[in-house]
């Protein structure tokens, strides 16, 4: 299984961020067997906190840090397990992991996104 995510995602403070995570598999998605975990890490060697799961249905774990700002925006049948994070704050900076199991595929897919929160719009690059 191959997972596609952006290595880094730069998001403006206060805006909404789509954390994209897509995968390809030799097998169609069977919702009874398919599983998904999204986790958050504050730093590279910090422990992971799970904030969203898919086990036949989406389970939003309502981590205190995200309150009600996370929602599932993907479609597993279309190999898309992306999530939306609303009103991004500096406290949201860190590492977001998506883990995917799609039996009978035996390999667990893993995507890692480094989220950086920008405090202001970056200056436009001179194209000349």
């Amino acid at each position: 299984m191959e997972v596609t995510v952006p290595a880094t995602l730069n998001v403006l403070n206060g805006s909404d961020a789509r954390l994209p995570c897509t995968f390809n598999s030799c097998y169609t998605v069977n919702h009874k067997q398919f599983s998904l975990n999204w986790t958050y890490q504050e730093c590279n060697n910090c422990s992971e906190e799970m904030f969203l799961q898919f086990r036949m249905k989406i389970i939003n774990l309502k981590l205190e840090r995200f309150q009600d700002r996370v929602e599932f925006s993907g479609n597993p049948s279309k190999y898309d397990v992306s999530v939306m994070l609303r009103n991004v704050q500096p406290e949201d900076e860190g590492i977001y992991n998506c883990y995917i199991m799609n039996p009978p595929d035996r390999h667990r897919g893993h995507g890692k996104i480094h989220l950086q929160v920008l405090m202001e719009e970056p200056p436009e690059r001179d194209s000349t």
Partner: nanobody, 116 residues
Framework: EVQLVESGGGLVQAGGSLRLSCVTS????????MNWFRQAPGKEREFVAR???????YYAESVKERFIISRDNAKNTVYLQMNSLKPEDTANYYC??????????RGQGTLVTVSS
């Protein structure tokens, strides 16, 4: 790998001042932003201040006009000067760093207690 070590915390009376330091070591050349966060017992972490490589600074509303973040690149150190401290500033203060490659690092923190 980057290491961050904070110091300068302690017990201070309301209205007093403290200066926190965060020394970075290891591969520090690609660090783009340095932040101070704080976490009070039983609460989520809270952003305090940020300084970019270019020296731009940003503050949480709750500390504006009272706290000043600065950096000394020659000493690989970021400072947080905290003035007019209030009891609600009591927390573990820790620094974090982000690299150009998107890696995130954090220190263990230094405890600040403000008594009334």
């Amino acid at each position: 790998e980057v290491q961050l070590v904070e110091s300068g915390g302690g017990l201070v009376q309301a209205g007093g001042s403290l200066r926190l330091s965060c020394v970075t070591s290891g591969r520090t050349s690609d660090l783009s932003t340095m932040n101070w966060f704080r976490q009070a017992p039983g609460k989520e972490r809270e952003f305090v201040a940020r300084i970019t490589r270019r020296g731009s600074t940003y503050y949480a509303e709750s500390v504006k006009e009272r706290f000043i973040i600065s950096r000394d690149n020659a000493k690989n150190t970021v400072y947080l000067q905290m003035n007019s401290l209030k009891p609600e500033d009591t927390a573990n203060y820790y620094c974090t760093a982000a690299s150009e490659m998107g890696y995130h690092y954090r220190g263990q923190g230094t405890l600040v207690t403000v008594s009334s």
